[in-house]
Amino acid sequence: QFLKEGQLAAGTCEIVTLDRDSSQPRRTIARQTVKCSCFPGQIAGTTRARPACVDARIIKTKQWCDMLPCLEGEGCDLLINRSGWTCTQPGGRIKTTTVS
């Protein structure tokens, strides 16, 4: 199987744009756009803090923690209204991700 230039292998993703805003103290806001080529039944998501193809049902039900979006050893919790998730590091630092 040969891929054309710029074509992604099925089941993989790449980051297209990544914008960071560090203007607020102790807070960095990052927005990223990703491109994925997913198998049937999958959709672009986040696994282990990186873009990945995930089960489409996860997105449909907004059970974000089922994507395993946090790094190993971090705890995942859904935000109120399932608008995203938080990853809590062992030291207590919390990273919040909202889905738009």
Epitope: Q1, A9, A10, G11, T12, C13, F39, P40, G41, T47, R48, R50, A52, C53, R57, I58, T61, Q63, C65, D66, L68, C70, E72, G73, E74, G75, C76
Partner: antibody
Framework: QVQLQESGPGLVKPSETLSLTCTVS????????WSWIRQPPGKGLEWIGY???????NYNPSLKSRVTISVDTSKNQFSLNLKSVTAVDTAVYYC??????????????WGQGTTVTVSS | DIQMTQSPSSLSASVGDRITISCRAS??????LNWYQQTPGKAPRLLIY???TLQSGVPSRFSGGGSGTDFSLTITSLQPEDFATYYC?????????FGQGTKLDIK
């Protein structure tokens, strides 16, 4: 390191329900997917299904009408129920951890397996 | 369902030999393929994921290749502990399916 241990009855009567539990030690059950696989005597491996941290499941369509996989995060355990068993369900049953290696989901930690015989 | 077909189903070789096992998927699975090794009475052990990435702790004499529908597992310089049954498994769809296995025994 993470270890898995299957437990449950080794003998089940036909038409009854096979119930097995997998206990996860050395790691959190919430950070992975978890799977059940079986292997009839002298045959190959058959994927039964897996469960997400939330309790959502994916099952093998060939068993879907009879199988239930559930998770108890407080006990760090997940379970398999297979109802209306017959002799063809006689097998070694394995539980396994499903690890998302980047884009590639693979079963990287396995229990030692438990033999279940269906017989009256 | 995606069907996985391994060949050969059995193979005899000697210590020090180089062997290759093939696995074919009934439709394209990109590189979403894993290889497992199983010795009698033991649980399977993950060798390779993503078609070619060696799992941690697996000796470098094992290697995997392929993409799409055709894959291979190669063992260079067979060691006594390598005589076992090998399974390929796709991770691109539900249900996850395994090949029927290739039994490698001593000639």
């Amino acid at each position: 390191q993470v270890q898995l241990q299957e437990s449950g009855p080794g003998l089940v009567k036909p038409s009854e329900t096979l119930s097995l539990t997998c206990t996860v030690s050395g790691g959190s059950i919430s950070s992975y997917y978890w799977s059940w696989i079986r292997q009839p005597p002298g045959k190959g491996l058959e994927w039964i299904g897996y469960i997400y941290p939330s309790g959502s499941t994916n099952y093998n369509p060939s068993l879907k009408s009879r199988v239930t996989i559930s998770v108890d995060t407080s006990k760090n355990q997940f379970s398999l129920n297979l109802k209306s068993v017959t002799a063809v369900d006689t097998a070694v049953y394995y539980c396994a951890r499903v690890n998302p290696f980047g884009y590639y989901y693979a079963m990287d930690v396995w229990g030692q397996g438990t033999t279940v015989t269906v017989s009256s | 369902d995606i069907q996985m077909t391994q060949s050969p189903s059995s193979l005899s070789a000697s210590v020090g030999d180089r062997i290759t096992i093939s696995c074919r998927a009934s439709q394209s699975i990109s590189t979403s393929l894993n290889w497992y090794q199983q010795t009698p009475g033991k649980a399977p052990r993950l060798l390779i994921y993503g078609a070619s990435t060696l799992q941690s702790g697996v000796p470098s004499r094992f290697s995997g290749g392929g993409s799409g529908t055709d894959f291979s597992l190669t063992i260079t310089s067979l060691q006594p502990e390598d005589f076992a049954t090998y399974y390929c498994q796709e991770s691109a769809s539900i249900p996850r399916t395994f090949g029927q296995g290739t039994k490698l025994d001593i000639k």
